[in-house]
């Protein structure tokens, strides 16, 4: 008799989901050096903890303590490089930028990246078929409560001046309802973070307006400011030249406005 | 699946250069790297050199300032510019395609790479 399985709205779990997990872990602690200690299996273990036989809409971070223990990872907290809507090219930066960090540069945020996951409750099986969407399931789920915990803890973790990429091309330059505005933005600890400084990139190769003056980032100014924190913005008018400076600065155009 | 094919290898006299290519069916993309591996007899399997899609190179430190890893993306090619080789050089060269999304590592059959003194 075919057991009757919850039906949700968002996508299930990535295929190959525990062998990606895994491999990612391994592949991780390899190119870093300084995580070699971390025993990927146990890694697994804690991670699959946090969500196999729970209902996916009754996630807590409290599931998730297990592994973020087992993922602690020292990065330099004046290093730290935010994203909201612009993940690649935040992405890109680092991998040229070596010394700066977006969450996903960190091994818990390397593993987890663009993959989705869910279990069942009262079963020790992966849900496959089906995973709760944020908005018309629940917010609780997997991997909503994932990313809200490494993302406050990664905000905690902030000193000196933070910088964020945002996306100038969205209607919403600085949205409150994405990670950013809603979880990162209300943990940067103001008697450690200095400034935060916005990079909103431009999509358009015309587009010349100051993008610092949108609504939405005089929002995000008044929010930062009444947390003790300094707030700049600079426009990133071509981000293609921008990543060429960042590799090549010695370059004789590169010392004009990007 | 990720094809790989590496050629180049060969027998050397030490002080001598060697140039590995391996071709990927994929290119390198976002998080997904190339790079060679090598394998001496009775000894495991060691990084050399790896490069990421912008040209983020790394190096084992036995080969650093004598061996260099380029990429032709246009090709989908890695290559290894092997220089002042040393009999301790001397295993079989393995081309590796690390595939972020996959969570998967393919590899190329190997190619010999021999050192004589």
């Known amino acids: 008799v075919p057991r009757w399985r919850q039906q949700w709205s968002g996508p299930g779990t990535t295929k190959r989901f525990p062998e990606t997990v895994l491999a990612r872990c391994v592949k991780y602690t390899e190119i870093h050096p300084e995580m070699r200690h971390v025993d990927c299996q146990s890694v697994w273990d804690a991670f699959k903890g946090a969500f196999i036989s729970k209902h996916p809409c009754n996630i807590t971070e409290e599931d998730y303590q297990p592994l973020m223990k087992l993922g602690t990872q020292t990065v330099p907290c004046n290093k730290i490089l935010l994203w909201s809507r612009i993940k690649d090219l935040a992405h890109q930066f680092t991998q040229v930028q070596r010394d700066m960090f977006t969450l996903e540069d960190t091994l818990l945020g390397y593993l987890a990246d663009d993959l989705t996951w869910c279990g069942e409750f009262n079963t020790s099986k992966i849900n496959y078929q089906s995973c709760p969407d944020w908005r018309k399931d629940c917010s609780n789920n997997p991997v909503s409560v994932f990313w809200k915990t490494v993302s406050r803890r990664f905000a905690e973790a902030a000193c000196d001046v933070v910088h964020v990429m945002l996306n100038g091309s969205r209607s919403k330059i600085f949205d409150k309802n994405s990670t950013f505005g809603s979880v990162e933005v209300h943990n940067l600890q103001p008697e450690k973070v200095q400034t935060l400084e916005a990079w909103v990139i431009h999509g358009g190769r015309e587009d010349s307006r100051d993008l610092c003056q949108d609504p939405t980032i005089k929002e995000l100014e008044s929010i930062i400011s009444k947390r003790n924190i300094q707030f700049s913005c600079k426009n990133i008018y071509r981000p293609d030249k921008f990543l060429q400076c960042v590799k090549n600065p010695e370059d004789s155009s590169c010392t004009s406005e990007i | 699946e990720v094809q790989l094919v590496e050629s180049g290898g060969g027998l050397v006299q030490a002080g001598g250069s060697l140039r590995l290519s391996c071709v990927a069916s994929?290119?390198?993309?976002?998080?997904?790297?190339m790079g060679w591996y090598r394998q001496a007899p009775g000894k495991q399997r060691e990084l050399v050199a790896r490069?990421?899609?912008?040209?983020?190179?790394n190096y084992a430190d036995s080969v650093k300032g004598r061996f260099t890893i380029s990429s032709d993306n246009a090709k989908n090619t890695v290559y290894l510019q092997m220089n002042n080789l040393k009999p301790e050089d001397t295993a079989v060269y393995y081309c590796?395609?690390?595939?972020?999304?996959?969570?998967?590592?393919?590899w190329g059959q190997g190619t010999q790479v021999t050192v004589s003194s």
């Open positions: 590796n395609y690390w595939h972020y999304a996959a969570g998967r590592d393919y």
């Open positions: 490069i990421a899609s912008l040209g983020i190179t």
């Open positions: 994929e290119r390198i993309f976002s998080r997904n790297t």
